[in-house]
């Protein structure tokens, strides 16, 4: 009778599907990851159940708490489609697909600097460029750690790219660039170049 | 190359047990599933039990309890244990590889070695 | 237990004709298309096919093609060769009770 009651109750929105989630959605391969099953009715012993293509990855029982699955993401076979099962006796239901974006990390950029100088001004134009991590990348250009550009999405791999004008400067500055891609808290610098502070010789960036 | 090659079938009386292998080489078993399958002579073919990449497996009904798969990642080997065999458990054992995340879409197969029940 | 059954048990045809089997599930199979199809021709072992319940595996002559869903399942064979009388088996993938596999009985093609 019970499993009747169960399968009538699927019937209604007193079972609906249950959600599949994980707090992480973008990975890099080697990646530790939890995926987690849930289902609104918090009264019911529900068995859930793990897939991903055509392969059962696991089952686990709960009651009220989310089952949660750890994976690690080591080939790219790995990114999905998953989907969880969520069952009472008899009856399930499934999840809706939910894959992983594996984005391998940035590498650390490299600054190029140039500098076209005239009597009073100094024309700089600096290039930013990470030869390795998946795109779209995103580049940020700093003065003494102050940013000085706003995110520049590169669609390709190609350097980014930010003029300035500055007055002959009084004292050297320091600059470095920032590359980020969708990998979340992960990001890398480029070694810093130093601007001297006077012109003539000691110019070395300069276009003479 | 690609290839499954089985091993460990003979003669064996009723009651008894034995071991098959299943030596996979050209691709890993922690990325792949393996099946094992039985034929028995002019008979259909019989799914007996699988062995995914993360070491899951899972057994027909009439195999729980008497047959166990199992594997040696070292040896890239997977092993199937037999034990109480019966005269009906005479067959042709294969091992298959599934594609990758779809343990049963058998795209591999092995050769195939006989095992044969009988006092 | 899951019933996969497979029918005609045989079929007798002729080289050009146009030959369908059918397999027919007690239960829906995993993602209503978790169904494969073999040919096994004597002493030898099993030949993947179709896939996906209708997807040509890697080599395959497009004569084969699949089609179904759920619990119903056909293999058809557009213009028979004579290299494809054999026999054909049919295999679904299952999560209802536990993760589980069933093959059909097979369909034995031979010469009319």
């Known amino acids: 009778r019970k499993a009747v009651l169960d399968c009538e109750a699927m019937k209604t929105n007193e079972f609906p599907s249950p959600c599949l989630d994980s707090k992480t959605k973008v990975v890099m391969k080697g990646q530790n990851v939890s995926m987690f099953c849930s289902h609104k009715n918090k009264s019911l012993q529900i068995t859930y159940s793990l897939f991903r293509r055509k392969t059962h990855l696991g089952t686990q029982d709960g009651k009220g708490e989310p089952a949660i699955f750890n994976l690690s993401i080591t080939e790219a076979h790995e990114s999905g489609p998953y989907k969880c099962k969520a069952q009472v006796t008899s009856c399930s239901k499934y999840s809706r697909d939910f894959s992983f974006t594996i984005v391998d990390p940035v590498t650390s950029p490299v600054l190029n600097i140039m500098v076209i100088q005239t009597e009073t001004d100094r024309h700089i134009t600096l290039h930013c460029l990470s030869v390795n991590g998946s795109l779209p990348i995103n580049y940020t250009f700093f003065e003494n750690h102050v940013a000085i550009s706003p995110a520049i999405s590169k669609y390709d791999r190609e350097p980014a790219e930010f003029n300035l004008t500055k007055k002959n400067p009084g004292e050297e500055e320091e600059y470095r660039c920032e590359a980020k891609n969708r990998l979340p808290n992960y990001a890398t610098y480029s070694h810093p170049v130093t601007m001297p502070s006077t012109g003539g010789d000691s110019c070395p960036f300069c276009l003479k | 190359e690609v290839q499954l090659v089985e091993s460990g079938g003979g003669l064996v009386q009723p009651g008894g047990s034995l071991r098959l292998s299943c030596a996979a080489s050209g691709f890993s078993l922690t990325i792949y599933t393996i099946t094992w399958v039985r034929q028995a002579p002019g008979k259909c073919l019989e799914w007996i039990g699988t062995i995914n990449s993360y070491g899951n497996t899972y057994y027909s009904t009439w195999a729980k309890g008497r047959f166990t798969i199992s594997r040696d990642n070292s040896k890239n080997t997977v092993y199937l244990q037999m034990n109480s065999l019966r005269a009906e458990d005479t067959a042709v054992y294969y091992c298959a590889r599934g594609y990758v995340d779809s343990d049963w879409y058998l795209n591999i197969w092995g050769q195939g070695t006989l095992v044969t029940v009988s006092s | 237990a899951i019933q996969m059954t497979q029918s005609p048990s045989s079929l007798s045809a002729r080289v050009g004709d146009r030959v369908t089997i059918t397999c027919q599930s007690s239960e829906s199979v995993y993602d209503n298309n978790y169904l494969s199809w073999y040919q096994q021709k004597p002493g030898k072992a099993p030949k993947l096919l179709i896939y996906?319940?209708?997807r040509l595996a890697s080599g395959v002559p497009s004569r084969f093609s699949g089609s179904g869903s759920g619990t119903q399942f056909t293999l058809t064979i557009s213009s028979l060769q004579p290299e494809d009388f054999a026999t054909y088996y049919c295999l679904g993938g299952y999560d209802s009770s536990g993760w589980y596999a069933a093959f059909g009985c097979g369909t034995k093609v031979t010469v009319l």
């Open positions: 996906d319940a209708s």
